[in-house]
């Protein structure tokens, strides 16, 4: 327990200080990878280690939360179903786009349904 | 677009406090940062905070931690800002705004604060 | 905190010259370094984002290089509508903080 204490650094996260406030991770070198991220709190700051992961696509990953709406009916055309979503929160520097479509492909069941209807409009 | 109005000037003796609000209209309100900033007179510009409207989210300057607090009203898309405890030196103008990463800034047209006794 | 600083304080021109306004972090902050001109009794105005990301409506005359710790604004022609106070600021770390400002002025 000893030692487990001493890797908390003074003025850290794990110390007294309440309200920690982090700036983003900003990788060393480039767009991605290894970097730090800057931490204060009152007069005390703190550098840690993080990393930004290189292969994220920046408008999907969770530097960008979207809320989304129902799913929309299946397109028996193509086998998918699209719903929009709308910009919720971005951290501060994510250059996030305000709205986004997300397509799935449809469950088989759904499939079937959408077929079943497509059928049933030709008649 | 995005239209920040301010709400007008005051003139608060020291010890007062004073409730700036910061309304906003045009495109979503609570997707985007809400910043404060301050300008004393013939000085530059300084940073209070922000607040994210979705969820209140805030980080303070520490400068300012017993000094300002921040909240938002959703219902009618208006930040605002309570400076305690004024003093001389908290007069300045002080300005919202509405911060996006990817298009950009949108400000209020500021709101002076005076503290005179 | 992250310490701007701005030169020249103040940049004598006239209309035509081209302006380089230099502003430099006191650590690396990779791009999160933006421009404001701020003319009298009115709010700032963003010129460039993120080192040299343009912004709509702002004159192409107007144009940022970085990223790391040394950031140039170069106004290419300067306009007599140009002259203003210029601050950097940088958003890599909180506090977000402001560069003293360099103050361009008519020669």
């Known amino acids: 327990v000893a030692k487990k204490k001493d890797k908390v650094k003074k003025g850290g996260p794990g110390s007294e200080c309440a309200e920690w406030a982090w700036g983003p991770c900003t990788p060393s070198s480039k767009d991605c990878g290894v970097g730090f991220r800057e931490g204060t709190c009152g007069a005390q700051t703190q550098r840690i280690r993080c990393r930004v992961p290189c292969n994220w696509k920046k408008e999907f990953g969770a530097d960008c939360k979207y809320k989304f709406e129902n799913w929309g009916a299946c397109d028996g055309g193509t086998g998918t179903k699209v719903r929009q979503g709308t910009l919720k929160k971005a951290r501060y520097n994510a250059q996030c786009q305000e709205t986004i479509r997300v397509t799935k492909p449809c469950t088989p069941k759904t499939k079937a349904k959408a077929k079943a209807k497509k059928g049933k409009g030709k008649d | 677009q995005v239209q920040l109005v301010q709400s007008g000037a005051e003139v608060k003796k020291p010890g007062a406090s004073v409730k700036v609000s910061c309304k906003a209209s045009?495109?979503?309100?609570?997707?985007?940062?809400m910043n404060w900033v301050r300008q004393a007179p013939g000085q530059g510009l300084e940073w209070i905070g922000m607040?994210?409207?979705?969820?209140?989210?805030?980080i303070l300057n520490q400068k300012f931690k017993d000094k300002a607090t921040l909240t938002v009203d959703i219902s009618t898309s208006t930040a605002y800002m309570e400076l305690s405890s004024l003093r001389s030196e908290d007069t300045a103008v002080y300005y919202c705004s509405s911060w996006s990463a990817k298009r950009g800034d949108f400000w209020g047209q500021g709101t002076l604060v005076t503290v005179s006794s | 905190e992250i310490v701007l600083t701005q030169s020249p304080a103040t940049l004598s021109l006239s209309p035509g010259e081209r302006a380089n306004l230099s502003c430099r972090a006191s650590?690396?902050?990779?791009?999160?370094l933006h421009w404001y001109q701020q003319k009298p009794h009115q709010a700032p105005r963003l010129l460039i984002k993120y080192a040299s990301q343009s912004i709509s409506g702002i004159p192409a005359r107007f144009s940022g290089s970085g990223p790391g710790t040394d950031f140039n604004l170069t106004i290419s022609s300067v306009e007599p509508e140009d002259f203003a106070v210029y601050y950097c600021q940088q958003s890599n770390s909180w506090p977000l903080t402001f560069g003293g400002g360099t103050k361009l002025e008519i020669k």
């Open positions: 607040i994210h409207p979705s969820d209140s989210e805030t």
């Open positions: 650590e690396s902050i990779s791009n999160n």
């Open positions: 045009g495109q979503s309100f609570s997707s985007y940062w």
